[in-house]
Every structure is written in C-alpha cells, then in structure tokens.
C-alpha cells in the first residue's frame, strides 16, 4: 500500500503520500481554531505508471493507453485513498467546543 | 456536475471530462476483442482551483492551502467520479462471449 509507513521511509518517485504540514492561520486563514495550531495533512504526488496501485479498471486502461501514447495528456493521477479525521478545539465565546473533522489527513494514495 | 453534458458543450478550462477515443488494438494492444473495435473512454483534465467540485474536506483544505501557497506542488487533482461499464464481445474458440467490463467509461470528474 502507498501509505505513510512505506512512503515516508522510502525515496519512492512514483505516486506516494508525501509529508505536508498545514498551519491553520498562515496557510488557510482560519484564525479561530484554538488547538491544534496546525496539523500533518500530507498530500499525494508522483507519476502513475502502468500497474502502479491502479484504482479501477479504467485507470488500468488509461495507464496502458499512456504506455502506448507517451505524449498524451490523458494519464491517471495520484490522489488520496485513505483519509483520517482530525479533532479540533475552538471557542464559542468563553466556551470550548471540540469537533471531529472528517477526511482531513491523508494516510495513503492511489492512482485514479 | 462536471459531466459529459456540461463539459462536452463548454470550453471549460478547469477540471472537466474530456473526449478520448481508445482503439483496443492500437492503443492497448488488445487484439482479441472482437466488438467494439474501440470506445469513448474519456478522461479528466484541468486545474482544480478553490471551490471547483471538491470531493472531500481534505480537498477543500488542499485547494485553500494552494490559494495561500500558489507555488506549492500540493494541489487537488482532476480524476474520474462517475464511471460506466462497457459491453464487449470476444471469441473463445468459435464461441462468442459477451462480457460487461465495469468502470470503463468516464461520465464525470471531481477534484480529489
């Protein structure tokens, strides 16, 4: 699997999950989130050659098409597969509120 | 929706489904398929700016991150959303066999 265990410990050039830290205030303009100040969101990057963690029958076909037509702009793309939630704390007036934000952290990628 | 109805009738620059015809023999090397000779597989292409058909909470965050950090390599990617099957005919000896290949035709795209 193209997950953090594999990708963070390798120098994989193909589609893999990469490290990305997002600061809520600086990177998103979300000044009102109290905790955390930011988080390891990660992102997916790298080419999707034929047979590399292909998602559907279509992505297999497209990767094969790409092999036969290397100059073509049609190619599978490296995108998130497994996403995890992130708990945040913010204040409504003086009252702290905890919320679980779904699908915020990339754990693995796929070629789609 | 970024589907064939919208995308094929517009000059949309952002993420949209594009026309792509795949010839089984020439483009994939699949000489054994009797019918059809090829099919309109289509593909997804175009940038994924802030708010453009974003798939998950994560893709919204990443698009927003990208707005604040325009030079970053982390950005959502335009990939298939709705896929449709394709019926094919091939021969096993002299006997024709009809098979439904799932997830072969792109009908719409999303930013993931």
């Amino acid at each position: 699997a193209l997950d953090t265990n594999y990708c963070f410990s390798s120098t994989e050039k193909n589609c893999c999950v990469r490290q990305l830290y997002i600061d809520f205030r600086k990177d998103l303009g979300w000044k009102w989130i109290h905790e955390p100040k930011g988080y390891h969101a990660n992102f997916c990057l790298g080419p999707c050659p034929y047979i590399w963690s292909l998602d559907t029958q279509y992505s297999k076909v497209l990767a094969l098409y790409n092999q036969h037509n290397p100059g073509a702009s049609a190619a599978p793309c490296c995108v998130p597969q497994a996403l995890e939630p992130l708990p945040i704390v913010y204040y409504v007036g003086r009252k702290p509120k905890v919320e679980q934000l779904s699908n915020m952290i990339v754990r693995s990628c796929k070629c789609s | 929706a970024l589907d064939t109805n919208y995308c094929f009738s517009s000059t949309e620059k952002n993420c949209c489904v594009r026309q792509l015809y795949i010839d089984f023999r020439k483009d994939l090397g699949w000489k054994w398929i009797h019918e059809p000779k090829g099919y309109h597989a289509n593909f997804c292409l175009g940038p994924c700016p802030y708010i453009w058909s974003l798939d998950t909470q994560y893709s919204k965050v990443l698009a927003l991150y990208n707005q604040h950090n325009p030079g970053a390599s982390a950005a959502p990617c335009c990939v298939p959303q709705a896929l449709e099957p394709l019926p094919i005919v091939y021969y096993v000896g002299r006997k024709p066999k009809v098979e439904q290949l799932s997830n072969m035709i792109v009908r719409s795209c999303k930013c993931s």
């Epitope: 303009g29 000044k31 009102w32 913010y90 204040y91 007036g93 003086r94 009252k95 | 708010i51 927003l64």
Partner: antibody, heavy 121, light 107 residues
Framework: EVQLVQSGAEVKKPGASVKVSCKTS????????MNWVRQAPGAGLDWMGQ????????NYNEMFEGRVTLTADTSTSTAYMELSSLRAGDIAVYYC??????????????WGQGTLVTVSS | DIVMTQTPPSLSVSPRETASISCRAS??????????MHWYLQKPGQSPQLLIY???NLESGVSDRFSGSGSGTDFTLRISRVEANDTGVYYC?????????FGQGTK
C-alpha cells in the same frame, strides 16, 4: 469587492417554513463564519446563529428553539437559513453577515441587504 | 446570557458637536486581554455597518471622527464633529459569551 446578496421578500402562512439564501462573492467563502441576524419591525438586532461553510459546523441561539437550520453550499458560495413553524412574531428582516474572522463568535464586517419575511394567514 | 443596555435610547445632536453613547454589559466582556465589544451604525433603510472592533479599533474605511473606549462592563462610542450623514441607530454588540448579543440601540 465583498458582496452578500440575499434572496427576495417572502410571504408565508403560519406554521410554514421559509428558506432565505445569501450568495457571496469577493472573498473565500470557506474562510469565514457566516452569521444570521434578524430585526423585527422597529426593533433591535437578534443573533440567530452561525455556520462555518467549510464543513458545516453550526452554533445556534437557543432562543430559536431548534426552529432554525443553517446550511451552506461551497460549490456556489451560498449560505442558507431555514426557519420552520413560522408565527406572527417571526415577521422581520433577516440578514446574513460575515464574521470578522478572528473568532467563531465575532463582530460582523459585511452584511447582506436583508430579506423581509412576512407571516400572514 | 449577557444583556447589553444602551443609553440614551435616543439623542439629538447639532452639526459639528460631539455625541456620546454608552453601553453597559450585565457582566464583564473582557477575556485574554481583549474587550469583546463592537459598535455598528444602521442608517435608515440600510443594513448595519461595523464602526469599531474590540472596543477601540476603528474599522477600515470608517471616518476617524468615530472612536470607542472602555473595558469590563462599561463602554462608550464618541462621534466628534457630527454630520447629518451620521443619522441612524447605533448598536453595541458583545461576543465574549454565547449567545452573541446586541444592545437595544440608540437613535
């Protein structure tokens, strides 16, 4: 230029629901909280609640007894306020107003033009 | 809930004079070194517009004839060299405690 453009005036029967829209432009919709404030004829301002459009988090004023529902469509940068079980006391101008951005509850720096809701049998 | 009381309910001021409006909160609206008190003007037939943010910060684009002061429970909005264009209803608002609340207005 930041703009908040609200839907037109509504006339509703008692017991019915009303849904007011607030189409925004000129700023990043998922960066700011959107508040809803109402003003009865000749009266002051009452805060109804707020929504963070990025993931739909909401905070409501208990005064509205669960009758108000706030939603947002990020694809069109539009916020919505639905008020159910309408009564005569709900006759008011309803405003959407963007939060200032430093806190969830905050000052409001841009306001829609207001939508008059009339309740009449 | 925090109740905001404005005085006077209405005020008539001659051009070029100074006007003062008071707002008292039922409990302190100070937290983390800030006073969570803001001032708005609603001109006839218009939506409210933000004048002062966090008790004393002038909102961008607002005339410097407007100034705010105070802390804790007592706050004041001052309008110097009053103009006819300043006519309307002035509201204070707190956001230190949920629910956010407004004063009843000063005309």
């Amino acid at each position: 230029e930041v703009q908040l453009v609200q839907s037109g005036a509504e006339v509703k029967k008692p017991g019915a629901s009303v849904k007011v829209s607030c189409k925004t432009s000129g700023y990043i919709f998922i960066t700011y909280w959107m508040n809803w404030v109402r003003q009865a004829p000749g009266a002051g301002l009452d805060w109804m609640g707020q929504i963070f459009p990025a993931w739909g988090s909401t905070n409501y004023n208990e005064m509205f007894e669960g009758r108000v529902t706030l939603t947002a469509d990020t694809s069109t940068s539009t916020a919505y306020m639905e008020l159910s079980s309408l009564r005569a006391g709900d006759i008011a101008v309803y405003y959407c107003a963007r939060g200032y951005g430093n806190y969830a509850l905050d000052a409001m720096d841009y306001w829609g033009q207001g939508t008059l809701v009339t309740v009449s049998s | 809930d925090i109740v905001m009381t404005q005085t006077p309910p209405s005020l008539s001021v001659s051009p070029r004079e100074t006007a003062s409006i008071s707002c008292r909160a039922s409990e302190s609206v100070d937290s983390y070194g800030n006073s969570f008190m803001h001032w708005y003007l609603q001109k006839p037939g218009q939506s409210p517009q933000l004048l002062i943010y966090l008790a004393s910060n002038l909102e961008s684009g607002v005339s410097d004839r407007f100034s705010g002061s105070g802390s804790g429970t007592d706050f004041t909005l001052r309008i110097s060299r009053v103009e006819a264009n300043d006519t309307g209803v002035y509201y204070c608002q707190q956001n230190d405690e949920d629910p956010l609340s407004f004063g009843q207005g000063t005309k």
